[in-house]
């Protein structure tokens, strides 16, 4: 059994910042979880992620140098990206894990969601690929 | 006057706890995103901790990870730190710091409290 | 994590003096950089913060530049209070780091 991942097919980041909101086909209340989001076709980066472990405080982390926060809402968890580039323009895909209680159940493949980065005036040096992992 | 006082350091084991406050005045403090950042003796600042402004998501420098623990008291206008399994290396003066803007995170530190002395030492 | 480095460690100069200090990002993080002020025995305090935008109630003789990977702090004339040690940070990946420090000291 899959968890089903809505999320907005695009989003443009004004100001470098962007709300990002992955809505799930199940309750996170009283749930231990890891939500993540991933940036590119292949998810190869991941971008930031939130750890729940039950109603407690959630856990915010980046392995990848992005800027992010993380909402909770009961069936849903908002990602809040910050300092975004324009050269960060890509797609960007919601993933849940639930480790308790058992069974452990993730998400199907979601479409994802494109990211149009509108930079107001931030221009970095072409090298610059954004963050990097370390 | 905005303000910030912390309080609750001092000397402790290695391996042992410590919780530290930091009083918030003359801002709503409910508004705004909170830091701590520490300085070993005679070194640089590096930063620790931060909590969003309602207390329910918090972030964690890998070096304390899974040891610290941050949150709030909004109604007291309170910011706490508690520091488990402490080491040597985690001996610093702990300033707590207010998120520059209301509302989001926007990691620039201002102001400072004026710090806590951390001894961790057996 | 991005590393800052700050040079030079210590710099030696009169009051009245011009103070050039510099920050060295080991990538870009644009505009997003911070200068800040430490005197022994207090907390730092905030200067300068996105690169070039003076905080509130700091003089005119402090100013910021730079942009990407290089920036630069100037105290136009130093005064006696302005013996202190500078940090500097950024913000724009995770974690926000700093450099290691910038003495500047009576000659």
């Known amino acids: 059994n899959k968890i089903l991942v809505k999320q907005s097919p695009m989003l443009v980041a004004y100001d470098n910042a962007v709300n990002l909101s992955c809505k799930y086909s199940y309750n996170l209340f009283s749930r231990e979880f890891r939500a993540s989001l991933h940036k590119g076709l292949d998810s190869a980066v991941e971008v930031c992620v939130v750890y729940g472990n039950y109603s407690q405080q959630l856990q915010v982390y980046s392995k990848t140098g992005f800027n992010c926060d993380g909402k909770l809402g009961n069936e849903s968890v908002t990602f809040y990206l910050q300092n975004l580039y324009v050269n960060q323009t890509d797609i960007y895909f919601c993933k849940i894990e639930v480790m308790y209680p058992p069974p452990y159940l993730d998400n199907e493949k979601s479409n994802g969601t494109i990211i149009h980065v509108k930079g107001k005036h931030l221009c970095p040096s072409p090298l610059f690929p954004g963050p990097s992992k370390p | 006057e905005v303000q910030l006082v912390e309080s609750g350091g001092g000397l402790v084991q290695p391996g042992g706890s410590l919780r530290l406050s930091c009083a918030a005045s003359?801002?709503?403090?409910?508004?705004?995103?909170m830091h701590w950042v520490r300085q070993a003796p005679g070194k640089g600042l590096v930063w620790v901790s931060r909590?969003?402004?309602?207390?329910?998501?918090?972030s964690f420098a890998d070096s304390v990870k899974g040891r610290f623990t941050i949150s709030r008291d909004n109604a007291k206008n309170t910011l706490y730190l508690q520091m488990n399994s402490l080491r040597a290396e985690d001996t610093a003066v702990y300033y707590c710091a207010r998120d520059r803007y209301s509302g989001s995170f926007y990691n620039w530190f201002d102001p400072w409290g004026q710090g806590t002395l951390v001894t961790v030492s057996s | 994590e991005i590393v800052l480095t700050q040079s030079p460690a210590t710099l030696s100069l009169s009051p009245g003096e011009r103070a050039t200090l510099s920050c060295r990002a080991s990538q870009s993080v644009s505009s997003y950089l911070a200068w800040y002020q430490q005197k022994p025995g207090q907390a730092p305090r905030l200067l300068i913060y996105?690169?070039?935008n003076r905080a509130t109630g700091i003089p005119a003789r402090f100013s910021g530049s730079g942009s990407g990977t290089d920036f630069t702090l100037t105290i136009s004339s130093l005064e006696p209070e302005d013996f202190a040690v500078y940090y500097c940070q950024q913000r724009s990946n995770w974690p926000p780091t700093f450099g290691q420090g910038t003495k500047v000291e009576i000659k």
């Open positions: 003359g801002f709503t403090f409910s508004n705004f995103w």
């Open positions: 909590i969003n402004s309602d207390g329910s998501s918090a």
């Open positions: 996105d690169a070039s």
